[in-house]
Interface confidence: medium
């Protein structure tokens, strides 16, 4: 039975040209995390595998940085980066948990960050 829950940064906003950290928490389960996939709508951004480490998709390697932790840093943000992002936790023995983050990239110089996790 899947007992875990994913907590995410939720709905967040950031300035065009800036950077943002996407982070998720998996809690309430003793399952082992074997891999975390980060996806933007239907595109794979990055994978962090427990044994093989990080892989950044070639088309994003100039604008995506691993971490902190199992999070993902998006850099040089454009308005086109606005949209849904998903953290997909592959676990054993529970299976797959998915968290959703909505990022809005603003032209304005005033971009409010939501939730607990913020880029310093």
């Amino acid at each position: 039975m899947m007992t875990g829950t994913i907590e995410t940064t939720g709905n967040i906003s950031a300035e065009k040209g800036g950077s943002i950290i996407l982070q998720c928490h998996l809690s309430s389960t003793t399952a082992q995390v074997t891999q975390v996939n980060w996806e933007q709508q239907d595109q794979l951004l990055a994978i962090c595998n427990a044994d093989l480490g990080w892989h950044i998709s070639p088309s994003f390697k100039d604008r995506v940085a691993p971490g902190p932790g199992l999070g993902l840093t998006l850099q040089s943000l454009t308005v086109n980066d606005t949209g849904e992002y998903f953290c997909i936790y592959h676990t054993y023995p529970d299976g797959t948990y998915t968290g959703r983050i909505f990022l809005e990239v603003l032209e304005s110089s005033v971009a409010e960050h939501g939730a607990r996790f913020q880029i310093p």
């Epitope: 950077s19 950290i21 982070q23 998720c24 928490h25 998996l26 809690s27 995390v33 962090c48 427990a50 044994d51 093989l52 480490g53 990080w54 940085a65 691993p66 971490g67 902190p68 932790g69 199992l70 999070g71 840093t73 850099q75 607990r116 996790f117 913020q118 880029i119 310093p120």
Partner: antibody
Framework: EVQLLESGGGLVQPGGSLRLSCAAS????????MSWVRQAPGKGLEWVSG???????YYADSVKGRFTISRDNSKNTLYLQMNSLRAEDTAVYYC?????????????WGQGTTVTVSS | QSGLTQPPSASGTPGQRVTISCSGD????????VSWYQQLPGTAPKLLIY???QRPSGVPDRFSGSKSATSASLAISGLQSEDEADYYC???????????FGGGTKLTVL
């Protein structure tokens, strides 16, 4: 060979400032997370500050507002500017490189530079 | 104040197996990978285990790491006198937005 060499430590009075440097060689400096870790005499390791490859900076609560981490990728050098120093900042300061695989294990350490804050 | 808890000391006799624990919470060990460091007297720390259980090249297979939920462990089998050192666990803490180390465990080989 991957190497880190710290410098800039010394004796300083409370309230004073110091700038530590860490010269890196043997790897592509700009591609790695870098950190400063300190160890007070007879105590354990305490992470002080880190700089991500995106240039985002992170600090331990104990040094926030007083210390500033920075890097010069053209010189392969990491810095720690320490202001408003206190007696409790007395420690050996190590520069450490993030691990290539999972980024946050620190796989290379310098030999450390000693900072003594005393009047 | 450390977000990771280690026993202050551990001991064993040559040839024995000893285990050092490192406990955290959902903001650090739960969602991030744990690494372990060995610090011999008077020297800089050395990476022993990364990614919960991976060994860097050159680290003997007598050293092994594991993690379950919010607790991680370092096991040393076939204990040798040169293993006498301080051992630290470490990981990223998502809430603090900072790296955290355990308080360290002093291993004595009797």
């Amino acid at each position: 060979e991957v190497q880190l060499l710290e410098s800039g430590g010394g004796l300083v009075q409370p309230g004073g400032s110091l700038r530590l440097s860490c010269a890196a060689s043997g790897f592509t400096f700009s591609s790695y997370w870098m950190s400063w870790v300190r160890q007070a005499p007879g105590k354990g390791l305490e992470w002080v500050s880190g700089i991500h490859i995106s240039d985002s900076t992170y600090y331990a609560d104990s040094v926030k507002g007083r210390f500033t981490i920075s890097r010069d990728n053209s010189k392969n050098t990491l810095y720690l500017q320490m202001n408003s120093l206190r007696a409790e900042d007395t420690a050996v300061y190590y520069c450490a490189k993030g691990h290539t695989v999972l980024q946050y294990g620190m796989d290379v350490w310098g030999q450390g530079t000693t900072v003594t804050v005393s009047s | 104040q450390s977000g990771l808890t280690q026993p202050p000391s551990a001991s064993g006799t040559p040839g024995q197996r000893v285990t050092i624990s490192c406990s955290g919470d959902i903001s650090n060990t739960r969602n991030n990978y744990v690494s372990w460091y060995q610090q011999l007297p008077g020297t800089a720390p050395k990476l022993l285990i990364y990614g919960n259980h991976q060994r860097p090249s050159g680290v003997p297979d007598r050293f092994s790491g594991s993690k379950s939920a919010t607790s991680a462990s370092l096991a040393i089998s076939g204990l040798q006198s040169e293993d006498e050192a301080d051992y630290y666990c470490g990981t990223w803490d998502n809430t603090l937005n900072a790296w955290v180390f355990g308080g360290g465990t002093k291993l004595t080989v009797l």
